[in-house]
């Protein structure tokens, strides 16, 4: 059975939407199949608002009878897109989302594209290639990622609040230095999560604190100077670099695609 290591190819297209294509990592296949290729399933995180291309197994059209894409989205009936080579016809059943289409004519390219990916595209996508000697499958558990909006502000004396708003999945928030922290999560109906971490530093030699937000779409770090003024409320939004305001400078660092290197801190 093939090893499920992945290759994620990302490119920029003219319409300024990133496009990613996920197929088998050739270097990791150790393919020893008999008649039927065992079901191969891949979990694939993909950013919202990008374009995604999903691939079938590498089988030449001349060997095929039918190509079917089966799409199972949450709360919807299963959608199938099928191409029968013999009659050169395509058929769709229960497919209402016009953003999910064949990349081109299925007799030229069996890949499926989502242009652009929306939060509702979370689900399971499977290519089934029917040959005279059995079926070959390639399945994708598509996980749509939403980048959270990050804010950091001081709301009381020596207390700071870091929020990662409407991310998917939930972001991880950690602090440097560690303080006395409480973290809350708020779940939204569209599947996004807001994480709010409130920290207090009793030690007076701590003057600057950093909030580090880890997320599959990238990591963000903001720092703030703790003001001694009682009741001071300082805030700034994440997303830029070197934001300044009247009271203090905040450094914001954005690290793309570092989802595989998160540090998980649990605060009480």
């Amino acid at each position: 059975q093939p090893n499920n290591s992945l290759m994620l190819q990302t490119s920029k297209e003219n319409h300024a939407l990133a496009s990613s294509s996920l197929c088998m990592d050739e270097k990791q296949i150790t393919q020893n199949y008999s008649k039927v290729l065992a079901e191969v399933n891949t979990s694939w995180p993909v950013k919202m608002a990008t374009n995604a291309v999903l691939c079938c197994p590498p089988i030449a059209l001349r060997n095929l009878i039918i190509i079917t894409w089966e799409i199972i989205l949450r709360g919807q009936p299963s959608c199938t897109k099928a191409y029968r080579k013999e009659t050169n016809e395509t058929k769709e059943t229960n497919c209402t989302d016009e953003r999910i289409t064949w990349v081109s004519r299925p007799d030229q390219n069996s890949d499926l594209q989502i242009r652009p990916v929306a939060i509702t595209h979370d689900g399971y996508y499977r290519c089934i290639m029917v040959t005279p000697d059995g079926n070959f499958h390639r399945g994708y558990h598509l996980q749509v990622l939403v980048t959270p909006e990050v804010t950091l502000f001081q709301n009381r004396n020596r207390t700071a609040v870091c929020k990662a708003v409407a991310g998917k999945p939930a972001a991880q928030i950690s602090w440097i230095p560690e303080g006395d922290c409480a973290t809350k999560q708020e779940y939204w109906s569209n599947g996004t999560v807001t994480v709010k971490s409130t920290c207090h530093w009793e030690v007076h030699n701590v003057s600057t604190v950093t909030c580090h937000v880890s997320h599959l779409t990238g990591n963000k770090s903001l720092y703030i100077e703790l003001l001694p003024v009682p009741g001071a409320k300082k805030s700034a939004k994440g997303g830029g670099s070197g934001l300044n305001d009247i009271f203090e400078a905040q450094k914001i660092e954005w690290h793309e695609g570092s989802g595989g290197h998160h540090h998980h801190h649990h605060h009480h």
Epitope: M7, Q9, S21, L22, C23, M24, E26, K27, I29, Q31, Y33, L37, V53, C55, C56, P57, P58, I59, A60, R62, N63, E86, N109, S110, D111, T131, P132, D133, F136
Partner: antibody
Framework: EVQLVQSGAEVKKPGASVKVSCKAS????????MFWVRQAPGQRLEWIGY????????KYNEKFKGRATLTSDKSASTAYMELSSLRSEDTAVYYC????????????WGQGTLVTVSS | DIQLTQSPSSLSASVGDRVTITCRAS??????????MHWYQQKPGKPPKLLIY???NLESGVPSRFSGSGSGTDFTLTISSLQPEDFATYYC????????FGGGTKVEIK
């Protein structure tokens, strides 16, 4: 065990035709596309065409169109390659090869049939 | 049609040597995340034997000293430590829509 057994060597005169057979065993003959490839002495391997016994689809290398004919006998699990209007440069070893689905690769080959064209 | 150019056309090597053969395609043979490039070994009077498929996958039963790499237009076959039975001719081959072979690389004893 998958096996492809080809017919024996042939000697032909220029202008004649030759028909090479490839008998398949160890698998369902109609399930796999059969390719024909030739190799002239000291030359690279050269594709002639393929036949899909499942639906009798054929495709030929432009170079051999009109001269090569690929057929199959499903009941005998045998593929045939006929080449007409032979010339001396057709002297080569002719191979049949079964295309495996995954990656369109050739794991199984016939042993080869030497066709000599000489006056 | 895609043309495949192999280099070198021949090479002399000794047992234990590391051998590298390259194959360049006239246009990309990679599509949908797969590179349709295979490598075969052929000995005199025998049909070709599949070594590597889809650029980098070792065919079952082939010794691990053989490896393949590359994508797009440039591909490499490497024999990490040449053995006496490896002296043969090696071909790259592309087979997506049309089938083409490289010109071959003959590996001879030095």
């Amino acid at each position: 065990e998958v096996q492809l057994v080809q017919s024996g060597a042939e000697v032909k005169k220029p202008g004649a035709s030759v028909k090479v057979s490839c008998k398949a065993s160890g698998y369902t003959f109609t399930s796999y596309v059969m390719f024909w490839v030739r190799q002239a002495p000291g030359q690279r391997l050269e594709w002639i065409g393929y036949i899909n016994p499942y639906n009798d689809d054929t495709k030929y290398n432009e170079k051999f169109k009109g001269r090569a004919t690929l057929t199959s006998d499903k009941s005998a699990s045998t593929a045939y390659m006929e080449l007409s209007s032979l010339r001396s440069e057709d002297t080569a070893v002719y191979y049949c090869a079964r295309e495996d689905y995954y990656g369109s690769r050739f794991v199984y080959w016939g042993q080869g049939t030497l066709v000599t064209v000489s006056s | 049609d895609i043309q495949l150019t192999q280099s070198p056309s021949s090479l002399s090597a000794s047992v234990g040597d590391r051998v590298t053969i390259t194959c360049r395609a006239s246009k990309s043979v990679s599509t949908s995340g797969y590179s349709y490039m295979h490598w075969y070994q052929q000995k005199p009077g025998k049909p070709p034997k599949l070594l590597i498929y889809l650029a980098s996958n070792l065919e079952s039963g082939v010794p691990s000293r053989f490896s393949g790499s590359g994508s797009g237009t440039d591909f490499t076959l490497t024999i990490s430590s040449l053995q006496p039975e490896d002296f043969a001719t090696y071909y790259c081959q592309h087979n997506r829509e049309l089938l083409t072979f490289g010109g071959g690389t003959k590996v001879e004893i030095k």
